[in-house]
């Protein structure tokens, strides 16, 4: 990029540059119209018969350098060929010299600085590539010379450019003073400011464009070369912040449109909002969940919104004494999540009717909550109690929802408690045809034993027809009509208000072979 400091082609007023010395044959300003009919200024000099050592100087106005360290001067000029000038003497030249002088203000006068090399700094002696020939009475013909010179390094606030003629017949058609700078550049979402190079290459720190953030790694920088060109593109750069995506060739970040989002900084474009979410504003990093839908704390910001599951279905109970096996089916609606678990709430009601949360004597296997399989075994149920179990399905967002958690209830009433099995049967007397039995009274938890039932049969006779029963209100019984010298198997059970208890273990007894043995007590 070139920044113009002076362009005589664009000057609308007289240039009025300073000449030295004030003699005839000096540089003179002329005006004309360019191809677009714009006013242009030129300078001419043609003192080809000058005295030896006589120089004609022309100095521009003071030019502020505007931070430039090296300034370029493009000269357009024509030069008459000495041979085509009839009056030209030996002092005729086809070159001129360019100088500059630096100062911190417009302090030069008609006489100062001294019109000589040092204080003026010589830039170059310029020779014409193309000479213009002039024949008497004819128009001069020849090409325009274009020469670009480099001034510097410059350090003061401004400078003057000066032209020294020592016998040329020439016209300085235009002067363009400019410096080169690296134009503002936006690349990889990084903005590098317009930079005037002060050296061969200058490192320039970049800054992220609006709504971009630095990418990991070293902060982005680029090198501005002396020729006003940026060196190769930066490796690292910036990336669009959450809610923004790269646009316009990676030069700016554009806010995600309504209904889209971008959760992280970095590459990638805005995505449509995931299921059950929406974004009502532009520039969303996250989409808001619809009413009744949530994201768990551990869910990624780009995850769909989910809802708690519905209640489990079809709870089936199997009561086995003080144990209960419950199983159920998965809920119809999982809420869109995989992390489904189950939990149970329990209430118990005594026979008298008072109810309370279940006590600590119940055990749940595998547990009362965080169940991943749809079943549980409850142990330690009390007899004659009514239990209500509420089975709930839960997932990762259940804790975020307000309102009641849906559940599937099941009621189970345990049986009242029957007496325990009767054991310790003793034979108190035996005869060839009878056996007298006695046993300890079992401790019945729910009321006293009302009576007993004795079940017996001859050993080896297993059929139902061979089994006989005997009821007794005492804890003893006499079995009659038995076979002589036969073995019998006897079992006893007790009955309370709750019903019969289980039969106890089979007791083995034997009748006498003959009467002579008489009655005798036998221990069980």
């Amino acid at each position: 990029l070139e920044e113009t400091l002076l362009n005589t082609k664009l000057e609308t007023a007289d240039l009025k540059w300073v000449t030295f010395p004030q003699v005839d044959g000096q540089w003179e300003e002329l005006s004309g119209l360019d191809e677009e009919q714009h006013s242009v200024r030129t300078y001419e000099v043609c003192d080809v018969q000058r005295a030896p050592g006589q120089a004609h100087w022309l100095r521009t106005g003071w030019v502020p350098r505007r931070g430039a360290v090296h300034v370029y001067a493009t000269l357009r000029f024509t030069m008459l060929e000495c041979l085509s000038l009839p009056r030209a003497g030996r002092s005729c030249k086809e070159t001129f010299t360019v100088f500059y002088y630096e100062s911190d203000a417009d302090t030069a006068t008609a006489l100062t600085p001294a019109w000589m090399e040092n204080p003026y700094i010589k830039v170059d002696t310029v020779a014409a590539e193309h000479l213009t020939r002039k024949r008497p009475g004819a128009e001069a013909t020849g090409k325009v010379n274009v020469k670009t010179l480099r001034l510097g390094p410059l350090s003061k606030a401004g400078f003057y450019l000066a032209f020294q003629d020592q016998g040329a017949c020439m016209a300085l058609l235009s002067l363009h003073l400019f410096y080169k700078k690296c134009a503002q550049l936006t690349v990889n979402l990084t903005r590098f400011p317009e930079t005037v190079p002060r050296e061969l290459v200058v490192p320039v720190a970049g800054s992220c464009v609006v709504d971009a953030v630095p990418a990991p790694g070293p902060s982005p920088s680029l090198y501005c070369r002396e020729d006003g060109q940026w060196a190769e593109q930066p490796v690292t750069g910036c990336s669009c912040a959450p809610g923004f995506e790269a646009a316009e060739g990676n030069t700016k970040c554009r806010a995600c449109a309504q209904g889209t989002f971008k959760p992280l900084s970095g590459e990638g474009s805005c995505q449509p909002c995931p299921a059950n979410s929406h974004s009502n504003t532009i520039g969303s990093a996250v989409c808001q969940c619809r009413v009744g839908y949530f994201r768990a704390r551990t869910d990624p910001r780009g995850a769909p919104c989910t809802t708690p599951p519905s209640a489990p279905r079809s709870v089936v109970s199997r009561l086995n004494g003080s144990s209960l096996h419950l199983e159920w089916s998965a809920p119809l609606e999982s809420g869109g999540r995989e992390d489904l678990t189950y939990a149970l709430r329990c209430r118990e009601c005594r026979p008298g009717g008072s109810c309370a949360p279940c006590g600590g004597d119940l055990t749940f296997d595998p547990g009362p909550r965080d169940l991943v399989e749809p079943w549980v075994v409850v142990r330690g149920l009390r007899p004659d109690f009514t239990y209500t179990f509420e089975v709930t399905a839960l997932n990762g967002v259940s804790s975020l929802a307000t309102g009641p958690v849906p559940f599937e209830p099941v009621n189970v009433t345990t049986d009242r408690e029957v007496p325990p099995a009767v054991s310790d049967i003793r034979v108190t007397r035996s005869s060839p045809s009878s056996l007298s039995l006695a046993w300890a009274v079992p401790r019945a938890p729910s009321g006293a034993v009302l009576d007993y039932e004795v079940k017996y049969h001859e050993k080896g006779a297993e059929g139902p027809s061979s089994v006989r029963f005997l009821k007794t209100s005492e804890n003893r019984a006499e079995l009659r009509g038995l076979k002589r010298g036969a073995s019998y198997l006897v079992q006893v059970r007790a009955r309370s208000e709750a019903g019969y208890g289980p039969f106890g273990q089979e007791h083995h007894s034997q009748t006498q072979l003959d009467e002579s043995e008489g009655w005798r007590e036998q221990l069980a």
Epitope: D14, E29, L30, S31, E44, C169, A171
Partner: antibody, heavy 128, light 108 residues
Framework: QVQLVESGGGLVQPGGSLRLSCAAS????????MSWVRQAPGKGLEWVSL??????????SYAAGVKGRFTISRDNSKNTLYLQMNSLRAEDTAVYYC???????????????????WGQGTLVTVSS | DIELTQPPSVSVAPGQTARISCSGD??????VHWYQQKPGQAPVLVIY???KRPSGIPERFSGSNSGNTATLTISGTQAEDEADYYC???????????FGGGTKLTVL
């Protein structure tokens, strides 16, 4: 020798026309930028019109008071400058001078900004 | 466009210095030329480019231009210098020329 000689002046009625001529000699006419300057009786100089050299496209310009009524032209083969004056008014009464702008050494696309050569003038009287 | 203002008349004793002014907005940024016109004659260029003197013009004629004022100075004025003097400049359009109203120099 180097000189300019005007002719064609005279008495003309308002609304009438007149053509002034300026014969140049002693210099390369087609390289010169030429102009007309007038001077009303007892008044100052007033620039009227300008024509560039041939190589500079022969562009013309006029003072506001005469634009559209006067036309400047040149015939380089005759080394002559013209001013065609139409719709003349009483206020156009003046001595009309032909003047040459300072010439470039060799590039007639450009000229110096002063008039370095003047003719003796020709009187134009517009009266009924 | 620029307007050039001159005093209508200036008087000077022979041998003294005469100064004729020409003023206009930022005139110092433009080149000013001076013309001498004697009665019944065509104008003659006496100073151009603010301070340059054409060949044949006596050294007593000089010019300067800065700020808003250009000045024609005649040192050691002579009777033959009695004439009307006009300043002139190009306008910014470059194709238009403006003259001052003229100053009558009387040599007493």
């Amino acid at each position: 020798q180097v000189q300019l000689v005007e002719s064609g002046g005279g008495l003309v009625q308002p609304g009438g026309s007149l053509r002034l001529s300026c014969a140049a000699s002693g210099f390369t006419f087609n390289n010169a930028w030429m102009s007309w300057v007038r001077q009303a009786p007892g008044k100052g100089l007033e620039w009227v019109s300008l024509i560039e050299a041939k190589e500079a496209n022969g562009a013309t310009s006029y003072a506001a008071g005469v634009k559209g009524r006067f036309t400047i032209s040149r015939d380089n083969s005759k080394n002559t400058l013209y001013l065609q004056m139409n719709s003349l008014r009483a206020e156009d009464t003046a001595v009309y001078y032909c003047a040459r702008k300072g010439m470039s050494f060799y590039n007639n696309k450009y000229a110096k900004s002063m008039f370095d050569l003047w003719g003796q003038g020709t009187l134009v009287t517009v009266s009924s | 466009d620029i307007e050039l203002t001159q005093p209508p008349s200036v008087s000077v004793a022979p041998g003294q210095t005469a100064r004729i002014s020409c003023s206009g907005d930022n005139l110092g940024k433009k080149y000013v030329h001076w013309y001498q016109q004697k009665p019944g004659q065509a104008p003659v260029l006496v100073i151009y480019y603010d301070s340059k003197r054409p060949s044949g013009i006596p050294e007593r004629f000089s010019g300067s231009n800065s700020g808003n004022t250009a000045t024609l100075t005649i040192s050691g004025t002579q009777a033959e210098d009695e004439a009307d003097y006009y300043c002139s400049a190009w306008t910014t359009t470059m194709m238009h020329i403006v003259f001052g109203g003229g100053t009558k120099l009387t040599v007493l």
